[in-house]
Interface confidence: low
Amino acid sequence: TIPPHVQKSVNNDMIVTDNNGAVKFPQLCKFCDVRFSTCDNQKSCMSNCSITSICEKPQEVCVAVWRKNDENITLETVCHDPKLPYHDFILEDAASPKCIMKEKKKPGETFFMCSCSSDECNDNIIFSEEYNTSNPDLLLVIFQ
C-alpha cells in the first residue's frame, strides 16, 4: 500500500514505478539550494528551509548536503534523480524514508550527504549514529 503522504491522484504522464512495481509520485521536498547553516555538533537538525517544492520528475528524491570548512557551514536542499550522481556521489540511501547523513570524502572540508523518499524528508537531517545503515527498517522501500 502507498503511505498516506504519497497518496495523490494519478496523472498518466507522471506515473513511474520502482523495481517492485509500486507506483511512485512526484516527491515533495525542501528546495532551498545552498544556504548558510548553524547546524553543528547535533544529532539532528531542521533545514530551516521555508521553500517546499514538488520535484520536476517523479523519480526524483529529496537530498540534503551538509558542508563545513574553515569559514562556514552550509546546508543544501534539493530534488535529484537517484540514477544520477550528485556532487560526484551515488545516492545510496534514496529509498530511505529518513534523511540519514553519511560522511563522504572531500578534500578541505567535512562533507555529509543524505537522500530520502518521503514528503519533505530532507527537512530533518539526522547525524546520530543510532540511525546507522545496519538498522533494517531504514532500508525498507517506503512503498510496501
Partner: antibody, heavy 122, light 107 residues
Framework: EVQLVESGGGLVQPGGSLRLSCAAS????????MTWVRQAPGKGLEWVSV????????YYADSVKGRFTISRDNSKNTLYLQMNSLRAEDTAVYYC???????????????WGQGTLVTVSS | DIQMTQSPSSLSASVGDRVTITCRAS??????LNWYQQKPGKAPKLLIY???SLQSGVPSRFSGSGSGTDFTLTISSLQPEDFATYYC?????????FGQGTKVEIK
C-alpha cells in the same frame, strides 16, 4: 490552456465568514502548489497563503493566521480559502494563483485567476 | 519578514524610452526575485523569475538583473502596452513578500 476561476466573493459583515473557491483547469492540478494573494482597493499585492500539491503543507501570512484556512480537493481540481472572523482590513480582491514548481522558478506564481472581490463592511 | 522596497513609486515616460525600476530587499535573497506586471482591473502577470530569467511569452525588451539585495527591472524600449504597475516579489522565504509597486504612466 491554464485557467483559474475564482468565486465566492461578496459583501460580508465584520466577524462573518466566507469561503472562496478557485476552479483550475488545463494542467495537472495535484502536482502544483497553489496560493492566494490579495489586493486591497488601490493598494499593492499581499501574499495570503500557500498549499502544497498533496495538501499536506500549508503556510499563512501572519495577518490571517488562525482566521483563514487554505485547502484543496484534488479530485475536483479546486482550491479553497475559508475566511472566518473577517475584518474591514480583509477587504480586497482575492487572487488564486499557481505557484511554479521547480528549481529557479520556485516561489514565483506563473498563472493567476482574475480575482474575486471580498468586501467586509457593516 | 523580508521587506521589499521599490523605487520610484511612480514614473512618467514616453513610448520608446528606456525605463529602469529598482527593488531592494531588507536582507540577502540570493536570486530569488520575481517581477510582475499588473494592468488596471487585471490580474498580475509574471515577467521575470529568478532575478533575470524571462518568463515564456514575455517580450525580450524586458530584462532583470541583480542578486543579493539589489535588483533591477529594465524595459529597453517602452511600448504603449507596457504602461502598468510593476511589482517585485522575493521568494527566498515564506512569506514571499511583494514590493509596494511602481506605476509607469504616460508622459
Amino acid at each position: 490552456e491554464v485557467q483559474l476561476v475564482e468565486s465566492g466573493g461578496g459583501l460580508v459583515q465584520p466577524g462573518g465568514s466566507l469561503r472562496l473557491s478557485c476552479a483550475a483547469s488545463g494542467f495537472s492540478f495535484d502536482i502544483y502548489a497553489m496560493t492566494w494573494v490579495r489586493q486591497a482597493p488601490g493598494k499593492g499585492l499581499e501574499w495570503v497563503s500557500v498549499i502544497s500539491g498533496s495538501g499536506g503543507t500549508t503556510y499563512y501570512a501572519d495577518s490571517v493566521k488562525g482566521r483563514f484556512t487554505i485547502s484543496r480537493d484534488n479530485s475536483k481540481n479546486t482550491l479553497y480559502l475559508q475566511m472566518n472572523s473577517l475584518r474591514a482590513e480583509d477587504t480586497a480582491v482575492y487572487y488564486c494563483a499557481r505557484r511554479a514548481q521547480y528549481r529557479d522558478k520556485v516561489g514565483a506564481t506563473d498563472y493567476w485567476g482574475q480575482g474575486t472581490l471580498v468586501t467586509v463592511s457593516s | 519578514d523580508i521587506q521589499m522596497t521599490q523605487s520610484p513609486s511612480s514614473l512618467s515616460a514616453s513610448v520608446g524610452d528606456r525605463v529602469t525600476i529598482t527593488c531592494r530587499a531588507s536582507q540577502s535573497i540570493s536570486s530569488y526575485l520575481n517581477w510582475y506586471q499588473q494592468k488596471p482591473g487585471k490580474a498580475p502577470k509574471l515577467l521575470i523569475y529568478a532575478a533575470s530569467s524571462l518568463q515564456s511569452g514575455v517580450p525580450s525588451r524586458f530584462s532583470g538583473s541583480g542578486s543579493g539585495t539589489d535588483f533591477t527591472l529594465t524595459i529597453s524600449s517602452l511600448q504603449p502596452e507596457d504602461f502598468a504597475t510593476y511589482y517585485c516579489q522575493q521568494s527566498y522565504s515564506t512569506p514571499p513578500t511583494f514590493g509596494q509597486g511602481t506605476k509607469v504612466e504616460i508622459k
